[in-house]
Each structure stands twice: as structure tokens, then as C-alpha cells.
Interface confidence: medium
């Protein structure tokens, strides 16, 4: 599924991401925009042999199990395919674990490079939340 901007903002808010670990909803929508272009089925392969999955591009080396990433930790204890569902529950629950891990949203390179320090509230402007 490819979410609309406000549709995703609403879904993320319903799942409790607004101000989760101090990160406003705009940060999460911005991250999803630049990680996956709001596409729940996005997959991208990395040079280390891992793959990033889903709307928040969660990595198979650390967070999920795709059956083929050497040394996978699967810290979210889920199959990576669950992160590709049109229901974002699994991605959100795993993202909550990731953002609680110490580096906050710096874990998402796209957030660090495209969202951090910008007017992230623009990503939820005009949305009925």
C-alpha cells in the first residue's frame, strides 16, 4: 500500500507514535517519506547483505528475520515480511523498539539526512488528526 501523507499521519497517531520518545508525529511522517515514499512494500538491499523492509525501512541484520541475513539478531522478533503489510502495526511496534535503543531516530539515515533540524511539522500541516 502507498499511503497518502495525511492518511499515514493519522495511522501513526493511532498507533501512538506522536511524541513517542519525544519525537513529534512530523518526524515519523518525514522519515517514512524519505525512507520508502510512503510505500509499505518497499524493500532495499544493502551492501552488507542485509535488506531494509517496509514503510520505515527496518533492517534485517538487527531488527527482523528474513531467513537469509548472516548473523541476524531479529530484535523485534518478527519475520521481515510482516513489515510489508498494509497494516503498519508491526512496523510501528518495531520502530518503537528501535527508537528506544539509544540513538533515537538517528537510526534512520534518511531522517538524519532529510528531516533532522528541518520544519517537520510541515509533514502534518493541513491534516485532520
Amino acid at each position: 500500500k502507498v499511503f497518502g501523507r495525511c492518511e499515514l499521519a493519522a495511522a501513526m497517531k493511532r498507533h501512538g507514535l506522536d511524541n513517542y520518545r519525544g519525537y513529534s508525529l512530523g518526524n515519523w511522517v518525514c522519515a517514512a517519506k524519505f525512507e520508502s515514499n510512503f510505500n509499505t512494500q518497499a524493500t532495499n538491499r544493502n551492501t552488507d547483505g542485509s535488506t531494509d523492509y517496509g514503510i520505515l525501512q527496518i533492517n534485517s541484520r538487527w531488527w527482523c528475520n528474513d531467513g537469509r541475513t548472516p548473523g541476524s539478531r531479529n530484535l523485534c522478533n518478527i519475520p521481515c515480511s510482516a513489515l510489508l503489510s498494509s497494516d503498519i502495526t508491526a512496523s510501528v511496534n518495531c520502530a518503537k523498539k528501535i527508537v528506544s535503543d539509544g540513538n533515537g531516530m538517528n537510526a534512520w539515515v534518511a531522517w538524519r539526512n532529510r528531516c533532522k533540524g528541518t520544519d517537520v511539522q510541515a509533514w502534518i500541516r493541513g491534516c485532520r488528526l
Epitope: Q41, A42, T43, R45, T47, G49, D66, G67, R68, T69, P70, P79, C80, S81, L84
Partner: antibody
Framework: QVQLQESGAEVMKPGASVKISCKAT????????IEWVKQRPGHGLEWIGE????????YYNEKFKGKATFTADTSSNTAYMQLSSLTSEDSAVYYC?????????WGQGTTLTVS | DIELTQSPATLSVTPGDSVSLSCRAS??????LHWYQQKPHESPRLLIK???QSMSGIPSRFSGSGSGTDFTLSINSVETEDFGMYFC?????????FGGGTKLEIK
């Protein structure tokens, strides 16, 4: 137990297209990548590409882009590879395998003859 | 693409001999190297994954070693059922690639 069952041998004319199937049983089909591998005598094994059935995400070896197209039907736990514009170079045995980085589970192979 | 070169192309041995098959990668692939055996008209069978991890049901005479770019499959005291083709495969990066194979034949 995990099994991959491929469709039977095919004899095709040059220029035609063919669709090979790979039915998976014994595991959650949507969770694992399905890989496709080509084997020609004297040419060893070549990785064609892969599909993740749960999402339809695909990756192709550059060499096979435009030649192979992968699809999957999650209702029947079956992956498909279509090969187009067939030539004699496409005559080979084609395998599906479950993509665990290494390939422990293989189909029995589908022999394609283009003649 | 990562190129895998296997040597020798053919190995003629007598049952009871011990042999080593080589697989060399064109760049470092860490330990992401796997070995397969293939008999005529059969699908490949995974023997060793990630350089040295033996698969269940595979006889203990098969072992793997190496890292980086140089890898070895060793067969301690070859048996008649071991004859066939052996392929290495890397999963360090895409596209996945295979070696050209070593044919193990009876002398």
C-alpha cells in the same frame, strides 16, 4: 516438510514465451524469498533473480532483465517465472529455490528446450 | 559482480583418497560462502553453509574452511557416492554468483 515442486518440461519455439511454476509447501510462503537459477551444460549455475511473495518485491540479475519476469500467487503458494522472446540460449534447466542466503531447498528443475 | 573461481576443474581420485577443492573470490566475501554437491539429473544439495557449517545429514567427512577470498572444501577419505560436481556460491552481495564447478571423478 519444505518442498518446492516445479512444472514439467517444456519444448518451445524461438520467439515464444513460457511460464514456469514453483509450488511451495511446508512453510510460510510469504515470508521467504524465492530465487530462480539457470543451469546450462558447460555454463554452471546462474542466479536469475528473486521475488518475495508476500509483497511482490523483485530483484533481477542485470543479465536477465527483460528476459525473466517473476510473479507469485499467495493463494496457491506458487511462484512463477516467465521467460520471453525465447532463443536457443534459453535452453536450460531452471530451478527455484528458497532464498536463505544459501539454498537448502530446491525444486526438482524444469527443463526448457527451445527448438 | 563477484567472480568465484573453482579449481581444479576436474579432480580424478581413488576411493579412500582425501581431497581439497578450492574456491577463490574476486573480492572479500567474509564467510558468506556455501558449497553444493550435484549428481547428474539431480538438483544441487547444500553441503556446507557459511564456509564451515555442516548441514544435518551430511557425512562428517565433508568440511569447509577459509575466509575473505580463499575457501576450501575438504573430503576426508572419498567414497564412491561422493563423485559428481561441486559448486561454491557467495551470498555476500547481489547478484548471487556461483563458481564454475569442480568435477570429482573416479580415477
Amino acid at each position: 516438510q519444505v518442498q518446492l515442486q516445479e512444472s514439467g518440461a517444456e519444448v518451445m519455439k524461438p520467439g515464444a514465451s513460457v511460464k514456469i511454476s514453483c509450488k511451495a509447501t511446508g512453510y510460510t510462503f510469504t515470508t521467504y524469498w524465492i530465487e530462480w537459477v539457470k543451469q546450462r551444460p558447460g555454463h554452471g549455475l546462474e542466479w536469475i533473480g528473486e521475488i518475495l511473495p508476500g509483497s511482490g518485491s523483485t530483484y533481477y540479475n542485470e543479465k536477465f532483465k527483460g528476459k525473466a519476469t517473476f510473479t507469485a500467487d499467495t493463494s496457491s503458494n506458487t511462484a512463477y517465472m516467465q521467460l520471453s522472446s525465447l532463443t536457443s540460449e534459453d535452453s536450460a534447466v531452471y530451478y527455484c529455490a528458497r532464498g536463505d542466503g544459501n539454498y537448502y531447498y530446491w525444486g526438482q528443475g524444469t527443463t526448457l528446450t527451445v527448438s | 559482480d563477484i567472480e568465484l573461481t573453482q579449481s581444479p576443474a576436474t579432480l580424478s581420485v581413488t576411493p579412500g583418497d582425501s581431497v581439497s577443492l578450492s574456491c577463490r573470490a574476486s573480492q572479500s566475501i567474509s564467510n558468506n560462502l556455501h558449497w553444493y554437491q550435484q549428481k547428474p539429473h539431480e538438483s544441487p544439495r547444500l553441503l556446507i553453509k557459511y564456509t564451515s557449517q555442516s548441514m544435518s545429514g551430511i557425512p562428517s567427512r565433508f568440511s569447509g574452511s577459509g575466509s575473505g577470498t580463499d575457501f576450501t572444501l575438504s573430503i576426508n577419505s572419498v567414497e564412491t557416492e561422493d563423485f559428481g560436481m561441486y559448486f561454491c556460491q557467495q551470498s555476500n552481495s547481489w547478484p548471487r554468483t556461483f563458481g564454475g564447478g569442480t568435477k570429482l571423478e573416479i580415477k
